[in-house]
Interface confidence: low
């Protein structure tokens, strides 16, 4: 899976969209999880309604919400009041039994609030070091990862 970069401004909301084949994933619940390290597990943050027919209802876990347009085939995750610690690698998942299919890998980047007194160009990254192939940028404030570029500079 390629990784898609979504950038948001600290303190504001960020919407992440994960398109999928609505026929292939018909009847399946979805989830948003956070990747723990390069080879680590993906820790569930929030999942859609237990009753698949009610997947359109927004479900919250803390400041993260999820809603699923099962006919159109778009899973939408909202990260409210974005904070530096929200930066990192996530996955949109389609659940079936004990299995989970990855719909999209997402790199969330948090930009400093330009109204803050810090340098408006600051970027927060998670601590792990991980490299990706290409990234398809979908957010209005966004950039592409170059092939081989390391998005998480090692922290000293």
């Amino acid at each position: 899976h390629n990784t898609t970069v979504f950038q948001g401004v600290a303190g504001q909301s960020l919407q992440v969209s994960c398109p999928y084949d609505s026929m292939k994933h018909w009847g399946r619940r979805k989830a948003w999880c956070r990747q723990l390290g390069e080879k680590g597990p993906c820790q569930r943050v929030v999942s859609t309604h237990n009753l698949w027919l009610l997947s359109f209802l927004r479900r919250w876990n803390g400041s993260t919400a999820i809603t699923d347009d099962t006919l159109g085939g778009t899973l939408t995750i909202t990260l409210r009041n974005l904070q530096p610690h929200d930066a990192g690698l996530y996955q949109c998942q389609s659940l079936h039994g004990s299995e989970a299919d990855t719909l999209r890998k997402v790199l969330v980047e948090v930009l400093a609030d330009p109204l803050d007194h810090r340098d408006a160009g600051d970027l927060w990254f998670p601590g792990e070091s991980e490299s990706f192939e290409d990234a398809h940028v979908e957010h209005s404030i966004s950039r592409s990862l170059l092939e081989g570029e390391i998005p998480f500079p090692p922290t000293s």
Epitope: W26, R28, H96, G97
Partner: antibody, heavy 123, light 112 residues
Framework: EVQLLESGGGLVQPGGSLRLSCAAS????????MNWVRQAPGKGLEWIGR????????NYAQKFQGRATISADTSKNTAYLQMNSLRAEDTAVYYC????????????????WGQGTLVTVSS | DVVMTQSPDSLAVSLGERATINCRSS???????????LHWYQQKPGQSPKLLIY???NRFSGVPDRFSGSGSGTDFTLTISSLQAEDVAVYYC?????????FGGGTKVEIK
């Protein structure tokens, strides 16, 4: 009318390989999972794996992982099963079978099966 | 993998009598979406398998109403209420809740 037609069976030498075809018609091939299932003479049914032709997504039973490859050509509405390093115990009738979809949940049941093609592994 | 265990291996029933086949799974077959993907197939001699019952209790199109399915969780039953000569076949239960899909060993139904 949904139809599945397998071909490519026959006599194969031990250590050889096979490539079976499953020609599908009468439904939207690219948006239904296609399975391969086999049945050894006088034995039960054994699931090999499946493919979603729309994007090529595949799953395999662990027993066949690395030895079986399932692919699909949506322009020909055909699914394929390639198996390598064949042994006598791979002698079986091989079936392709489509997954039924029934709203509001996926049924994930195999509603249409091909007639099967016999593969005999022998020297 | 989910292991499917059928019983009995074979069954001889008089015409018009009831036939009951049991199927047990090694783990619950309830999917995360709430559905249970337990199905029954019928295979007559020299033929391909045919879908009989899907999702525990739903008869597939064209299947006579003498066939019924029941059960939940890990224990399931296929019942033929009044056995007919054309019902002589091997019956398989199968789960598709989890990958890999798995089948029971089959139950051969004959006329007594």
């Amino acid at each position: 009318e949904v139809q599945l037609l397998e071909s490519g069976g026959g006599l194969v030498q031990p250590g050889g390989s096979l490539r079976l075809s499953c020609a599908a018609s009468g439904y939207a091939f690219s948006s239904s999972w296609m399975n391969w299932v086999r049945q050894a003479p006088g034995k039960g049914l054994e699931w090999i794996g499946r493919i979603y032709p729309g994007d090529g997504d595949t799953n395999y039973a662990q027993k066949f992982q690395g030895r079986a490859t399932i692919s699909a050509d949506t322009s020909k509405n055909t699914a394929y099963l390639q198996m390598n390093s064949l042994r006598a115990e791979d002698t079986a009738v091989y079936y392709c079978a489509r997954l039924l979809r029934n709203q509001p949940g996926e049924s994930y049941a195999m509603d249409y099966w091909g007639q099967g093609t016999l593969v005999t592994v022998s020297s | 993998d989910v292991v499917m265990t059928q019983s009995p291996d074979s069954l001889a029933v008089s015409l018009g009598e009831r036939a009951t086949i049991n199927c047990r799974s090694s783990q619950s077959l309830v999917h995360s979406n709430g559905y249970t993907y337990l199905h029954w197939y019928q295979q007559k001699p020299g033929q391909s398998p045919k879908l009989l019952i899907y999702k525990v209790s739903n008869r597939f199109s064209g299947v006579p109403d003498r066939f019924s399915g029941s059960g939940s969780g890990t224990d399931f039953t296929l019942t033929i209420s009044s056995l007919q000569a054309e019902d002589v076949a091997v019956y398989y239960c199968s789960q598709s809740t989890r990958v890999p899909y798995t089948f029971g060993g089959g139950t051969k139904v004959e006329i007594k």
